[in-house]
């Protein structure tokens, strides 16, 4: 019996379509597949950012694959052909590996790239990113921000830069149609007559950097002689009620501080007849049902009740 062999895929390459980190891995079928015309050939693809300990592994019948990478680092990938056991009357046959790498030739020293990049998606409506200029760069250095997410035809430049001393130090993004729950890619590059500037690449998902508005319309309602219900409304905007967690801070008579985290827009507080003053504030955050992470809102305006008669049905400021 002659040993069955198969060649690795041809023309294996990593293609950068200009999407700031979303790359195409593509290849052609191996040579000499004539013997296996009745057979569906598969490919095992492994890839990673250089420096990563683990490979991502994909088995596919296609001749391409797409995924996001960190372009601050290089990318390495390898692929081989798989002939399933049905094609070989026995065990699976694998080709040798075809390998390829990709990296963007870095310009400038690392210190010239932007520092302390910070992006917040305010109230799931307005994206604002800010940064500090690189270390030791001159005032003639300017930074430009580009972004892309799946659904855009090409990477777009920032529309509204925030400036300090004539330098771009931030970006107010235009509206971002259907941009959450997918990777959002940013590149901040720079130019200077003095020296080359290192580009920086960032990837995140918008729903994970949401900072909501604080809750509004805080009220008290007497439930019983020893219970008061605190109520508030969800902040205005596009975030649905089911997406909020709340943190409450309650102060009784300037001494007792109660803090609680709740999922609803109410909290029932046990009180004593001696209570003379009650104040509370609330803040909101997008919960685990709608995001993997988030930023607490500012605290709401304080709502207080002061006086002797805590037996009133409804207590409003």
């Amino acid at each position: 019996d002659t040993e069955i062999k198969v060649n690795p895929p041809q023309d294996f390459e990593i293609v950068d379509p200009g999407y700031l980190g979303y790359l195409y891995l593509q290849w052609q079928p191996p040579l000499s597949l004539d013997h296996f015309k009745e057979c569906t050939v598969e490919y095992e693809l492994k890839y990673r950012n250089i420096g990563s300990e683990t490979w991502k592994t994909i088995i596919t019948k296609n001749l391409h694959y797409k995924d996001g990478f960190d372009l601050n680092k290089g990318i390495e990938a390898k692929i081989h052909t798989l002939l399933p056991w049905q094609c070989t009357n026995g065990s699976e046959v694998q080709s040798s590996w075809a390998e390829t790498t990709y990296w963007i030739s870095p310009q400038g020293i690392p210190e010239t790239k932007v520092q302390d990049m910070d992006c917040v998606y305010y109230n799931w409506q307005y994206l604002l990113c800010s940064w500090k200029p690189g270390i030791g760069v001159l005032l003639d250095t300017n930074y430009n921000l580009f972004y892309w997410y799946e659904g855009l035809d090409h990477a777009l430049q920032c529309v509204d830069y925030i400036k300090a001393d004539g330098q771009n130090i931030g970006c107010r993004f235009p509206y971002l149609e259907a941009s959450d729950y997918k990777d959002f890619y940013i590149c901040v590059n720079g130019s200077s007559e003095n020296k080359p500037i290192r580009s920086s690449y960032f990837t995140f998902q918008l729903q994970n950097i949401v900072k909501p508005l604080p809750p509004v319309y805080l009220t008290f309602t007497r439930e019983s002689s020893c219970e008061i219900k605190l109520k508030w409304s969800i902040p205005l905007g596009p975030i649905p009620a089911r997406c909020f967690d709340y943190e409450i801070e309650i102060r009784e008579d300037d001494t007792t501080l109660v803090t609680a985290t709740v999922e609803n827009e109410t909290y029932t507080l046990k009180t004593t007849n001696e209570t003379r003053q009650l104040c509370f504030v609330v803040r909101s955050k997008v919960n685990i049902y709608c995001s993997d992470d988030g930023i607490w809102s500012e605290w709401s305006d304080k709502q207080c009740w002061e006086g002797e008669d805590l037996s009133k049905k409804t207590l409003l400021r």
Epitope: Y122, Q125, Y126, L128, V159, D160, I162, F173, P174, Y175
Partner: antibody, heavy 119, light 111 residues
């Protein structure tokens, strides 16, 4: 919750200056551009300029030929518009109006400040 | 500066009818794939109210009967079915370049 509260009506003589304030609340003041727009009696709207409270960057309408000065006090969440060398045609209602960047339009407006220039 | 011309200057219609207001710019207000055209409604004694931004996107709390369309130099505000509270003055405004400019307004009055 977003509110822009402007200072009260003013009556000024020709050649004088007027300074209108706009106190913002219910949002993070530095995140939004603040615009100033005026409207003469029975007339349309005229954009005067804008300030970015985040960094103090300002754009002016050159039609006002250096007569307008826009400033802000971020600690007080307040923007100001000063118009100098007043003339009778400056009689108008002056509005402050916030907007998040140029692609979003101007979504909240102050109540307006009436400025009358008369000798 | 970019000059905006609104037409008609006055539009007389009855409640329940469809209103179509036009705005033409002296040069394109498109950039970055966005049309920097906004529409405002103003009633006597009140500040303007943002209806539409970026040519076609509804402002917060604006009823669905208000819609915007267009790109480049020609833009339209449509009110699909007029309500009594819709009779007011409507302004278009460009925010592509400084100075931001407004159209002269269209007065929508009850027939």
């Amino acid at each position: 919750q977003v509110q822009l509260v402007q200072s009260g009506a003013e009556v000024k003589k020709p050649g004088a200056s007027v300074k209108v304030s706009c106190k913002a609340s219910g949002y993070t003041f530095s995140n939004y551009l603040m615009n100033w727009v005026r409207q003469a009696p029975g007339q349309g709207l005229e954009w005067m300029g804008r300030i970015d409270p985040y960094d103090g960057d300002i754009d002016y309408n050159q039609n006002f030929k250096d007569r307008v000065t826009i400033t802000r006090d971020t600690s007080a969440s307040t923007a100001y518009m000063e118009l100098s060398s007043l003339r009778s045609e400056d009689t108008a209602v002056y509005y402050c109006a916030r907007g998040y960047g140029t692609a979003y339009g101007v979504d909240y407006w102050g109540q307006g400040t009436s400025v009358t220039v008369s000798s | 500066e970019i000059v905006l011309t609104q037409s008609p200057a006055t539009l007389s219609l009855s409640p329940g009818e469809r209103a179509t207001l036009s705005c033409r710019a002296s040069e394109s207000v498109d950039n970055y794939g966005i049309s920097f055209m906004n529409w405002f409604q103003q009633k006597p004694g009140q500040a303007p109210r943002l209806l539409i931004y970026a040519a076609s996107r509804q402002g917060s709390g604006i009823p669905d009967r208000f819609s915007g369309s267009g790109s480049g130099t020609d833009f339209t505000l449509t009110i699909s079915r007029l309500e009594p509270e819709d009779f007011a003055v409507y302004y278009c405004q460009q925010s592509k370049e400084v100075p931001w400019t407004f159209g002269g307004g269209t007065k929508l009055e009850i027939k």
